[in-house]
Interface confidence: low
């Protein structure tokens, strides 16, 4: 097919010195000689489709996908993996050539998959699918940690089944809430698997490899501390173990504690009891309940009973899958253009979600706060006032979820004008969408205040960028016109923006900027 | 407390029109994204239209477009839903909604802040 682009996908190594995750670019780093990965048509796809051989990549290592294009004119381009779109910044070599690259730095497992590369030139579009996957990825894992008791020991070991072998580390604080943030003062890490202080307020246990880190957090009911709201809620899935932990303080020794699933007390060596004197004095008592292995009956409402503290609940639940539980409805907001604003997603999920925030191709970090109802939240606030479409995007390894979100800022018409040999145009992002209307400047009305009533033709809202919706209004020229001067306005509820054309110019001619 | 009161419900005739009027007790009606909804008996509330705050952006469920007509007059406080060629699954009570925050569009019921009563319209020969 003679209007085919001759197209090269090429794989280039490179040598290991760099930290940070995936990225497109059109500067790749310094490496080794490129290497072809034999872009051939893909038979019977819809539109024109090219595969390029799969990439195998050890974990770690860095590498770029790159595409040549001989193709005439210039390109734009997108890429997208697992339903995100990445920058796409084209450019050309000596030989004049469309250069685009995909950079990916350190490959994870989160990295391998299908890359999808959409170009468009003056002549056509097409597509070109790389496929990267981990070089032995069942050697390489990561997998959250679980808790299990040791042998004729009060202490818990904490594993994490992974490849390479992680580092185990217990993360302890003795603070409530926001005090027990990684980094705080209040935070004592012990790197070790083994763990004979369970007193602590708060105790977790973190595996961490090349692949990155993965926490479980001792699930605490403490007798103490006055009760949620809403039932604390902790979800497994059907074979995971099972660990709640019941504190509780009292003056002295004289009280003990029981666990209930359904008001019926735990069988014999589903619970173990520790007990310590704190430095006032008083007597701390912590009472395990545990099931190495739950099934679907494990299910229920667990309570811990005190002979001296109101007694508390947690409700288990075991479910065959993850989920993520959220409403997945578009929202649209519009925000003045100094207002202080965040975008806000609330779900339920479980295993705990890894999350993408993304505007205009560009991927943001994510972060989860776990709210007191058992739900979590992801706010995101660096939008910088741009308008248009941002997405979160969550997944667990057994659900994903994705929440659109439109953001307009209010603010009056900026007018762009251009001219052509019949008609000229003015478009507008301003926010409501503006109105348009066109005057003539004569000697007549030197001021513009001459209405041109016909010839105008008004399009709203009929282009996005990234989700920004643009209004334009063209006006066609007769003969009559021609060597005028004339006005667009463009007028919302927040201001008037004007642009002076020059008609029958040999090219765009705006030169009066008039608001 | 936002406050809203619905009214222009009634018996229409397949084919005809209503206008329902929904009145907002506050001053600050026009910092508000407002929508109405329905509930048919027996059926889950549903979203049938909503405006934002400043007018500048409209949405419609897919089974009311090109019929129903959603506007507001801030100057007046108050919302309207204008509904042509009416049928008979058009029949339920109609509720007026003001947004969560001051910016987020009503399209979902959580994040519906504030309710009014409802109308109730009859569609039927």
């Known amino acids: 097919n003679q209007d085919l682009p001759v197209i090269k996908c090429v794989l280039i190594n490179h040598k290991n010195n760099d930290s940070s995750v995936g990225k497109s670019s059109s500067y790749p780093m310094v490496s080794e000689s490129p290497e072809d990965l034999g872009c051939a048509l893909r038979p019977q796809s819809a539109g024109t489709v090219y595969e390029a051989a799969t990439v195998e990549v050890d974990v770690s290592a860095s590498i770029t996908l790159q595409v040549l294009v001989d193709t005439p004119g210039n390109i734009s381009c997108l890429w997208v993996f697992k339903h995100s779109s990445l920058n796409c910044q084209p450019h050309f070599d000596v030989q004049n050539r469309g250069v685009v690259s995909m950079v990916i730095l350190k490959m994870t497992e989160t990295q391998a998959g299908e890359y999808l590369l959409f170009i468009q030139s003056e002549a056509t579009n097409y597509t070109i699918v790389f496929t990267v996957s981990i070089r032995n990825t069942l050697l390489f894992t990561l997998r959250r940690p679980y808790f299990r008791k040791m042998e004729n020991q009060d202490a818990l070991v904490c594993i994490s089944e992974s490849v390479p072998e992680p580092i185990v580390e217990w993360v302890l604080c003795d603070s409530q809430g926001e005090s027990c943030k990684e980094e705080s003062p209040a935070v004592v890490k012990k790197e070790e698997k083994v763990l004979h202080e369970l007193f602590g307020t708060d105790i977790r246990c973190c595996a961490r490899n090349e692949l990155g880190r993965e926490c479980t957090r001792l699930f605490t009911i403490d007798l103490n501390q006055t009760p949620q709201t809403t039932l604390p809620q902790l979800f497994l899935k059907v074979g995971e173990p099972l660990w709640i932990r019941c504190k509780a303080v009292h003056v002295n020794h004289g009280f003990g504690l029981t666990w209930e699933l359904e008001n019926k007390a735990l069988e014999e060596g589903s619970y173990f009891e520790m007990s310590t004197y704190s430095t006032n004095r008083t007597m701390i008592r912590i009472l395990f309940a545990f099931v190495s292995s739950v099934a679907r009956n494990d299910t229920g409402y667990y309570t811990c009973s005190s002979s001296k503290h109101p007694s508390q609940s947690a409700l288990v639940t075991i479910v065959e899958k993850g989920f993520i539980n959220a409403t997945n409805s578009s929202e649209d907001y519009e925000i003045d253009q100094y207002e202080e604003f965040c975008f806000s997603v609330r779900f339920k999920a479980y295993p705990q979600i890894r999350c993408t925030w993304t505007f205009s191709r560009k991927a943001f970090p994510c972060e989860q706060k776990a709210l007191d109802d058992g739900y979590s939240v992801s706010k995101f606030c660096n939008h910088k006032h741009q308008p248009g479409e941002y997405i979160f995007h969550a997944e667990n390894g057994d659900a994903q979820f994705t929440k659109m979100f439109t953001l307009n800022i209010r603010r009056k018409p900026q007018v762009l004008a251009e001219a052509s040999a019949s008609q000229a145009s003015c478009s507008s992002d301003g926010y409501p969408l503006p109105s348009w209307t066109w005057k003539k400047c004569s000697d007549k009305s030197p001021n513009c205040t001459e209405d041109i009533p016909e010839g105008v033709w008004n399009r709203k809202a009929n282009r996005k960028v990234f989700g920004q919706w643009v209004s334009s209004s063209t006006l066609n020229m007769s003969e009559a016109m021609k060597g005028f001067l004339v006005k667009c306005c463009a007028y919302n509820s927040l201001g008037t923006s004007c642009e002076t054309i020059l008609l029958n110019s040999p090219g765009p001619f705006p030169f009066i900027q008039d608001s | 407390e936002v406050q809203l009161l619905e009214s222009g419900g009634g018996l229409v005739q397949p084919g005809g029109s209503l206008t329902l009027s929904c009145a907002a007790s506050?001053?600050?009606?026009?910092?508000?994204?407002m929508g109405w909804f329905r509930q048919a008996p027996g059926k889950e509330r549903e979203f049938v239209a909503a405006?934002?705050?400043?007018?500048?952006?409209?949405y419609y469920a897919d089974s009311v477009k090109g019929r129903f007509t959603i506007s507001r007059d801030n100057s007046k406080n108050t919302l309207y839903l204008q509904m042509n060629s009416l049928r008979a699954e058009d029949t339920a009570v109609y509720y007026c909604?003001?947004?969560?925050?001051?910016?987020?569009?009503?399209?979902?019921?959580?994040?519906?802040?504030?309710w009014g009563q409802g109308t109730l319209v009859t569609v039927s020969s």
């Open positions: 909604a003001a947004g969560g925050s001051t910016r987020v569009v009503v399209t979902t019921t959580p994040v519906v802040k504030y």
């Open positions: 506050e001053r600050t009606f026009s910092s508000y994204t």
């Open positions: 405006m934002s705050w400043s007018g500048g952006s409209t």
